[in-house]
């Protein structure tokens, strides 16, 4: 039975050209975490494997840093990068776990971050 | 188009050192890591290792640690691998290959080279 | 180590015949599989990733199905230039493992 839950950063918002920081925790499971995907509505951005390291899709290297921990820094951003991103955790023995993060990418400096909540 | 070619066969003693080489051409070299896979004669396949040109960090299959060591020039977008201490059953053909898009399975492959180690 | 089995070992078939090769992980790796293809003498070929995606090239009478510990290639028609030996592998953990290998051979 999977009990956890994957709290997430929410609803954000940076300006353009600027950095974010994607980040999802897994909770209330013993589960062990064997893979975390990040990905940009169905595009993969990166995998962090607990057992290879980080794969960064290559069309993406210049503009995505691993990490923090589990999570994904994007950089120089641009306002086509406005959408939902997905953290997808793999684990044992639960199975796989999603998040969900809405991010938008302003023109302007009224970027602020928005409430975590939580996805069941 | 996207190629991979890989330095001659090698012919060396017991307790000797080589090091392959492998070409890239026709894609951004730092963006994609590139593997190491041997296939001695008549048997199946088994990776050695990979590298990450754009920061040059190794993963090595526990194996093969302390055998081979990665490195690359991305100067000239190549990538070597050194194997020591080499015995007879290192007698195998070596493969570069062309990391995938989506993760840690291999795109394209060079040709290969084989290293015979015989006293 | 994940060890991947591969059967058959070894097939005879005939020019368009439809042809199924498995491959058994020992434990669940997903979709995490990828399908390569080799001729005598010659490096291996990518046919399959992710367990069912083709690279650009590849004839799309090849295709691949399956997630967690049971995956199969499938050559819909055998075409005289698929007769080689067929490799799966993970990509899911450290050791990246390859099957034993299935030979198609010429019935």
């Known amino acids: 039975m999977m009990t956890g839950t994957i709290e997430t950063t929410g609803n954000i918002s940076a300006e353009k050209g600027g950095s974010i920081i994607l980040q999802c925790h897994l909770s209330s499971t013993t589960a062990q975490v064997t893979q975390v995907n990040w990905e940009q509505q169905d595009q993969l951005l990166a995998i962090c494997n607990a057992d290879l390291g980080w794969h960064i899709s290559p069309s993406f290297k210049d503009r995505v840093a691993p990490g923090p921990g589990l999570g994904l820094t994007l950089q120089s951003l641009t306002v086509n990068d406005t959408g939902e991103y997905f953290c997808i955790y793999h684990t044992y023995p639960d199975g796989t776990y999603t998040g969900r993060i809405f991010l938008e990418v302003l023109e302007s400096s009224v970027a602020e971050h928005g409430a975590r909540f939580q996805i069941p | 188009q996207v190629q991979l070619v890989q330095s001659g066969a090698e012919v060396k003693k017991p307790g000797a050192s080589v090091k392959v080489s492998c070409k890239a051409s026709?894609?951004?070299?730092?963006?994609?890591?590139m593997y190491w896979v041997r296939q001695a004669p008549g048997q199946g396949l088994e990776w050695i290792a990979f590298?990450?040109?754009?920061?040059?960090?190794?993963t090595y299959n526990q194996r093969f640690r302390g055998k081979a060591t990665l490195t690359v020039d991305t100067s000239i977008s190549t990538a070597y691998m050194e194997l020591s201490r080499l015995r007879s059953d290192d007698t195998a053909v070596y493969y570069c290959?062309?990391?995938?898009?989506?993760?840690?399975?291999?795109?394209?492959w060079g040709q290969g080279t084989l290293v015979t180690v015989s006293s | 180590d994940i060890q991947m089995t591969q059967s058959p070992s070894s097939l005879s078939a005939s020019v368009g015949d439809r042809v199924t090769i498995t491959c058994r992980p020992s434990?669940?790796?997903?979709?995490?599989l990828s399908w390569y293809q080799q001729k005598p003498g010659k490096a291996p070929k990518l046919l399959i990733y992710?367990?069912?995606s083709l690279p650009s090239g590849v004839p799309s009478r090849f295709s691949g199905s399956g997630s967690g510990t049971d995956f199969t290639l499938t050559i819909s028609s055998l075409q005289p230039e698929d007769f080689a030996t067929y490799y799966c592998?993970?990509?899911?953990?450290?050791?990246?493992?390859f099957g034993q290998g299935t030979k198609v051979e010429i019935k």
């Open positions: 434990e669940n790796i997903y979709t995490y």
């Open positions: 026709g894609y951004a070299f730092s963006r994609y890591s």
């Open positions: 290959a062309r990391g995938g898009d989506y993760g840690w399975y291999l795109g394209v």
């Open positions: 590298i990450d040109p754009y920061n040059g960090g190794s």
């Open positions: 592998q993970h990509h899911y953990g450290n050791p990246l493992t």
């Open positions: 992710n367990a069912k």
